[in-house]
């Protein structure tokens, strides 16, 4: 799920400081698996540039030979850089690594644009800045691509924490996350809180430094405020939930939910933007023209191509409205919305105006595959992926950026009624799902 | 057919205030379609965006000269105007108003200028 | 900040030749651009816009090309009334504000 539009910056005040907390359920924590309150190792071990993906230091081999790779919910492959490419300061050499076994088996990934191909074996794999562990993990050795690396994004791989069913070349290929909890006492959960930097960019900046964290294993406590609400995890394949209702500033788009779902919806950290079916972008954006009626902005401002800027500290982020989700709750007939701000699905560039300037992109877009919540909502949120439960959780993010005025939220429960009805059923034909590129 | 005509005093003092208004004929400077434009050209050379006004009264300016310019909208009379304050004779140019359309983009109707000399 | 870079300063063309103008860009704009053209005294007038896109009114023998970085103009065969000076202008960055030098075409 490589490609297409990649993760954003955003403007805006940090995060309120850790001791605000709100108070959280007092049986909330007994129903979370795996380690609990604090996993300071892995607190921080995410780093990315703008618009390039948020990636976490791995070693492969023996001797360790360091990676950074591209941390990516929207894919199952772990696939790394092993022969010299123009954008790559270093690859995974197999050749030197005394624990490669090779499987003999290529593997072709075609997206919307580009692709990579490569060679599948497997090696010993470690997270410095994760848990304790090594293990032996399927990899693809990428041989030859096009469009895939991103020059001077600083990672040389993916770490597709996906499903099997989307694993490339078939579902036998296991992935990543599978290896290490079957090889480990590691829980069947990871979360993720991508943090973005927080300022809007300047020429000397331009490839400034985004954060955050992947904990495995479990939750920690410190990256979010409030508390976790969890929606079911519909089919294991993509992380795939249902949203059963979509209101700007408070107004309903009073859309058939399944066109919410129109093919399907996923969580993606792979993928900047919040993409939505053709229908569902048109009346959004019609809701938000109209809601930030006072100022027009050119068509291509919309189609997510032209910059605005304002005057640097001048954004008017009042009149940009609040987008909301709401996502099936555990609980028959419940939902919660999760809501962001356009300091999130406003995403800063690198000024191409004046150093006077704070320039933006519009981060909501079309899709033909269904909807996508890519870093524009993640980098609201803390978010759990909670494998063993079935369920992704969503809290607010202790570094998401928002103003004095308005904050992201997690809300709940609302009374939803059939909200089964609002998850769109594919049509099983070969292969037709595996809709691999993400323009 | 819409016109736009620039008006105002061709010779301001060195620190004064230079006040231009555009008359809009033919057509309604409440279109929702359009911004509104300044732009000057000092003599012999290129071109320079001053700043954009919506009929709503919300304005972009280049950055430039922000700290300077105040743009504003009278929808009753059809007009908008452009204040300079503390000109130099670096201001000197030919000012023209323009409407900004193709979809706010595109500077697509002009007014015939006006030069403006800052001298004392 | 976006340069915008036209080239030649003075182009010196017959009546019946072919222009071809050049402007480019320091980052991509897309197709974001637009042609303008200026006579002495004049006001300037749009001729094409998002690139290659004709504005109203504007003759045929005048046509835009490019995207990205690079953009053309070209007059098939100079008409008289060509004579002026053109300028290209981005719009990717908005509200738009970043206009290029100049190029005069001129009279061999």
């Known amino acids: 799920t490589h490609l297409g539009i990649r993760l954003p910056l955003r403007s805006g005040l940090a995060g309120p400081p850790l001791g605000l907390r709100l108070p959280r359920e007092t049986d909330e924590e007994s129903e979370e698996p795996g380690r609990r309150g604090s996993f300071v190792e892995m607190v921080d071990n995410l780093r990315g540039k703008s618009g390039q993906g948020y990636y976490v230091e791995m070693t492969v081999g023996s001797p360790p030979q360091t990676l950074n790779i591209l941390v990516d919910t929207g894919s199952s492959n772990f696939a790394v850089g092993a022969a010299p490419h123009p954008f790559l300061h270093r690859y995974y050499q197999r050749q030197l690594s005394s624990t490669y076994r090779d499987l003999r088996k290529g593997v072709y990934v075609p997206y919307t644009q580009g692709k990579w191909e490569g060679e599948l074996g497997t090696d010993l794999v470690s997270i410095p800045h994760g848990p304790n562990v090594t293990v032996r993990a399927n990899i693809a050795a990428i041989t030859e691509s096009d469009k895939f690396f991103i020059n001077g994004s600083n990672w040389e791989g993916i770490l597709g924490l996906a499903y099997a069913e989307i694993a490339r070349p078939d579902d036998s290929l296991e992935p990543f996350f599978d290896s290490l909890v079957k090889q480990t006492h590691i829980p069947n959960i990871f979360s993720l809180q991508l943090c973005g930097a927080g300022f809007p960019l300047n020429q000397t900046e331009a490839l400034a430094s985004v954060g955050g964290s992947m904990i495995i294993g479990g939750i920690d406590h410190s990256l979010y405020t409030g508390r976790l609400w969890y929606t079911p995890i519909r089919r294991e394949w993509y992380y795939e939930v249902i949203i059963v209702r979509v209101e700007i500033n408070g107004q309903d788009l009073k859309m058939d939910c399944k066109e919410y779902n129109y093919d399907k919806s996923i969580v993606d950290s792979g993928t900047t933007n919040l993409r939505l079916p053709k229908k569902v972008f048109e009346a959004a954006v019609k809701s938000i023209k109209a809601a930030s009626s006072t100022e027009k902005f050119p068509d291509g401002f919309w189609l997510g191509e032209q910059l605005v800027c304002w005057q640097a500290g001048t954004t008017p982020w009042n009149i940009f409205p609040v987008i909301s989700l709401y996502l099936m709750g555990e609980v028959t007939n419940q939902s919660f919305r999760i809501t962001i701000l356009p300091q999130q699905y406003l995403r800063p560039v690198e000024d191409v105006a004046t150093s006077q300037d704070d320039c933006y992109k519009f981060a909501v877009s079309q899709s033909s595959t269904g909807t996508v919540m890519g870093a524009v909502i993640m980098e609201g949120f803390y978010v759990v992926f909670d494998r063993a439960r079935k369920r992704i959780g969503f809290a607010v993010s202790a570094c998401h950026v928002h103003d004095e005025f308005r904050t992201a939220a997690v809300e709940g429960p609302f009374v939803t009624a059939d909200m089964e009805d609002c998850g769109y059923n594919i049509p099983q034909t070969d292969e037709s799902t595996l809709m691999t590129g993400r323009a | 057919q819409l016109q736009l005509q620039e008006s105002g005093p061709g010779l301001v003092k060195p620190s004064e205030t230079l006040s231009l208004t555009c008359t809009v004929s033919?057509?309604?400077?409440?279109?929702?379609?359009?911004?509104w434009s300044w732009i000057r050209q000092p003599p012999g050379k290129g071109l320079e965006w001053i700043g954009n006004?919506?009929?709503?009264?919300?304005?972009y300016y280049n950055p430039s000269l922000k700290s300077r310019v105040t743009i504003s909208v009278d929808t009753s009379k059809n007009q908008f105007s452009l204040k300079l304050s503390s000109v130099t004779a670096a201001d000197t140019a030919v000012y023209y108003c323009?409407?900004?359309?193709?979809?706010?983009?595109?500077?697509?109707?002009w007014g015939r200028g006006t030069l403006v000399t800052v001298s004392s | 900040e976006i340069v915008l870079t036209q080239s030649p300063a003075t182009l010196s063309l017959s009546p019946g030749e072919r222009a071809t103008l050049s402007c480019r860009a320091s980052q991509s704009v897309s197709s974001y651009l637009a042609w303008f053209q200026q006579k002495p005294g004049q006001a300037p007038r749009l001729l094409i816009y998002?690139?290659?896109n004709r504005a109203t009114g504007i003759p045929a023998r005048f046509s835009g090309s490019g995207s990205g970085t690079d953009f053309t103009l070209t007059i098939s065969s100079l008409e008289p009334e060509d004579f002026a000076v053109y300028y290209c202008q981005q719009v990717y960055v908005w509200p738009p504000r970043t206009f290029g030098g100049g190029t005069k075409v001129e009279i061999k």
């Open positions: 323009a409407r900004l359309g193709h979809g706010y983009n595109y500077f697509d109707l």
């Open positions: 033919g057509g309604s400077i409440s279109w929702s379609s359009y911004y």
């Open positions: 998002d690139a290659s």
């Open positions: 006004i919506y009929y709503s009264g919300s304005t």
